[in-house]
């Protein structure tokens, strides 16, 4: 019996087609992805093949103005329109709190939403009961397939799930649910979830009875043969893991941002064992037409977004200096504003010993593309912020050793004076440079704000200590020459859309007046 698994993950609000780098579509003839194009390909496959499941491995939420405005209603609407069969909860599904998950998505989705390792307690338990499930048995033709969900247990540090959801260890939580499926005579089981490729492989290895793992969170691109675009494969598709009980378990992921549709064909024997698995992600490029009906619906929903862009988010009573003359040479108040917003967006009081789990922010000055003039009645709009942060990036959470941070700050000024983008703006950091010294030895003082303290204060950076830092995904990926971050980071979790982080902060503060205050000397 043959099953076709179509899968997406980490779509992050890319409902419309995007450029090849998943930013805003500029030249339509070269654009990719989007739900209208995805629908065309899915329908093509559904028409051609008998047993097809369309699955999503989480993080539909967060990433563009679509999520900012529609807050998840767009996810439910268009996933329903595409007729998804199941979805696993990702960490970003909790970005607007549990209510922001329940109302727009859990109550509106026609498909089951899954996670076996999230347990509700207290008053939330009855409120959320039945709205998400540990597993679901799906009929496919004359057979049944069990889908069991999982979500990153780091979610409390990455999003806002509140205090009434417990995120258990994935493997510990999955095993009894898979065992239950086996007792229900379900012998074909897919683990669908959002914990990253390393955990996906562990699940394949450790959870007895799981036949296939469909993952997300790490934006992993797997491919067999010559890859069709710029993404470099982390391994073959599917990635085969030998389980502890000797089975070959295919593990898949489909990069991110709706650029690819994962396509996996699995052949099962009559006892539900995987006989063979093959496939590849399908690049959703312009050779695949956008479905006119879904496209028309997208255009209808778009109208509200255009109106939102020009509405006032808040006010500034000072000039927000985002000029390259400032931000690539010295501390600039736009950099301070953005870093303050980045830290504010990551306030998570999950431990009494820590005032917060992260206190530091770094931001390449070259990523700040425009100032905002306060003389327009102080008004700040989404449109204004889109000029400051036009690249559609995210502000991510990484873990780095102090020694890596020291290298990053040396790189920040290694060719100071040439108006290059690598000059770092900061938050929760005091750095002193001596530019008379030779490149690679210019950082003379580097103090960082403590986290394990009740009164935050600055202490000297310790080379061997591991620190959490918020930074743009561009830097996490080694952009602007920050190869040391990419090579040496110990953990990387993708965060919220850059403009959304700053706009939320401005809306919260109502009136802002960021200063240049001696963070960089």
């Amino acid at each position: 019996w043959e099953l076709t698994i179509l899968h997406t993950n980490d779509v992050h609000s890319r409902l419309e087609q995007t450029s090849e780098d998943s930013s805003k579509c500029v030249n339509a003839s070269r654009c990719m992805g989007g739900v209208a194009r995805l629908f065309t390909k899915v329908q093509q496959i559904r028409r051609a093949e008998p047993n097809v499941l369309l699955l999503d491995a989480g993080d539909q939420y967060q990433g563009t103005i679509w999520f900012t405005v529609y807050k998840g209603a767009e996810v439910a609407h268009f996933m329903n329109a595409l007729r998804y069969d199941a979805m696993a909860l990702g960490n970003h599904e909790f970005d607007n709190g549990v209510e922001g998950l329940i109302e727009p998505l859990l109550k509106e989705a026609k498909f089951p939403i899954l996670s076996a390792n999230i347990k509700a307690k207290g008053p939330l338990a009855s409120q959320i009961s039945g709205l998400y499930l540990p597993y679901k048995v799906l009929p496919v033709g004359d057979e049944v397939v069990g889908i069991v969900g999982y979500t990153s247990k780091e979610t409390p540090f990455l999003s806002n799930p509140g205090t009434n959801l417990v995120f258990e260890d994935e493997i510990t939580a999955l095993q009894p649910e898979v065992d239950k499926l086996k007792t229900l005579n379900v012998n074909k089981i897919i683990a669908l979830g959002h914990s990253g490729f390393e955990m996906d492989k562990l699940i394949a290895q450790k959870v007895r009875g799981v036949d296939v793992v469909v993952g997300g969170h790490s934006n992993t691109f797997l491919y067999t043969g010559n890859p069709p675009s710029k993404e470099v494969p982390a391994g073959k598709y599917p990635f085969i893991v030998t389980s502890d009980d000797g089975r070959k378990v295919p593990v898949v992921q489909a990069y991110a941002f709706g650029k690819y549709l994962g396509y996996l064909k699995i052949e099962f024997d009559e006892r539900g064992n995987v006989i063979s698995s093959h496939g590849n992600p399908i690049l959703l490029n312009s050779s695949i037409p956008e479905d006119p009906s879904i496209k028309a619906d997208i255009n209808k929903w778009r109208i509200k977004l255009d109106n939102y862009s020009t509405q006032e988010l808040g006010k500034t009573i000072v000039y927000l200096d985002g000029s390259s003359q400032s931000c690539r040479f010295r501390e600039c108040n736009m950099g301070n504003l953005i870093c303050d917003a980045m830290i504010n967006n990551n306030l998570r009081h999950t431990d009494e010993m820590f005032w917060n789990h992260v206190s530091m922010c770094i931001l390449n000055g070259g990523g700040i593309r425009s100032p905002i003039d306060e003389r327009n009645n102080g008004t700040i709009t989404w449109e204004n912020l889109a000029a400051v942060l036009p690249f559609g990036g995210t502000f991510d959470l990484v873990q780095l050793k102090g020694s890596t941070l020291k290298k990053a700050f040396e790189h920040s000024v290694h060719r100071y004076g040439q108006s290059t983008g690598e000059f770092l703006q900061v938050g929760g950091i005091h750095v002193v440079y001596d530019l008379s010294r030779k490149p690679g030895d210019r950082v003379v003082k580097l103090d960082v704000l403590c986290t394990k303290c009740r009164v935050p204060s600055y202490d000297p950076l310790k080379m061997d200590e591991v620190y959490k830092v918020i930074l743009p995904n561009f830097l996490a990926n080694g952009g602007d020459g920050f190869q040391m971050i990419k090579d040496e980071l110990l953990r990387h979790d993708s965060g919220d859309q850059d403009i959304n982080v700053v706009s939320t902060y401005i809306s919260k503060m109502k009136v802002i007046y960021p200063a240049v205050e001696g963070r960089i000397k």
Epitope: F39, Q43, R46, R47, A81, R83, D85, K110, F111, L138, P139, V140, G141, D142, E143, V144, D291, S293, I294, A296, D297
Partner: antibody
């Protein structure tokens, strides 16, 4: 082979009740949504009810809502339509039809031969 | 509710003719449209689903097209056994609704 056979039709007085059955064979009945569709003499097709594969949801058009109830017994591979408060306009051939395997609306790939229901005093 | 309007309600054609029947939805239904054939005193038979997919066993002279609100069923070369009534049906949302039917008669 895949087959649907309806039974239970007949002549009934207005206001009375009737229960139709549909016996399924040749496929995994419990995996499919099942529908009733009717056709009044000389008229077109009208959808009457659906029950999802796991009985989790049932849907009806306004014309029969509150009067008709669809149910199924997966252990017996049988679909039912309980029709109460019957009216003259319910006179039709009632077909049972197989839908899809999910919770989304679907088309009908397999149809029964139909059973005639006549509501008349 | 979504209204389905079929046209024409009847047509006369000869064997070998190309026949086109149209179906219009009162609102967008994407490609969630099916076509059925019904002969007198018989149950309907599924021809096409998802607007353009041929049900297995249906001759390739039948084809469907369209998306959104406007759909077409085409019989490329009418055969004697094709004289029947044809219905479209939307399955975008409940309640499921049918077109009024198109009767294809012998000229």
């Amino acid at each position: 082979q895949v087959q649907l056979v309806e039974s239970g039709g007949g002549v009934v007085q207005p206001g009375r009740s009737l229960r139709l059955s549909c016996a399924a064979s040749g496929f995994t009945f419990s995996n499919y949504g099942m529908h009733w569709v009717r056709q009044a003499p000389g008229k077109g097709l009208e959808w009457v009810a659906v029950i999802l594969y796991d009985s989790s949801n049932k849907y009806y058009p306004d014309s029969v809502k509150g009067r008709f109830t669809i149910s199924r017994d997966n252990s017996k591979n049988t679909l039912y339509l309980q029709m109460n408060s019957l009216r003259a306009e319910d006179t039709a051939v009632y077909y049972c039809a197989r839908g899809g395997s999910s919770w989304y609306p679907d088309s009908f790939d397999i149809w029964g031969q139909g059973t005639m229901v006549t509501v008349s005093s | 509710d979504i209204q389905m309007t079929q046209s024409p309600s009847s047509l006369s054609a000869s064997v070998g003719d190309r026949v086109t029947i149209t179906c219009r939805a009162s609102q967008g239904i994407s490609s969630w449209l099916a076509w059925y054939q019904q002969k007198p005193e018989k149950a309907p038979k599924s021809l096409i689903y998802a607007a353009s997919s041929l049900q297995s066993g249906v001759p390739s002279r039948f084809s469907g097209s369209g998306s959104g609100t406007d759909f077409t069923l085409t019989i490329s070369s009418l055969q004697p056994e094709d004289f029947a009534t044809y219905y479209c049906q939307q399955y975008n949302s409940y309640p499921l609704t049918f077109g009024g039917g198109t009767k294809v008669e012998i000229k």
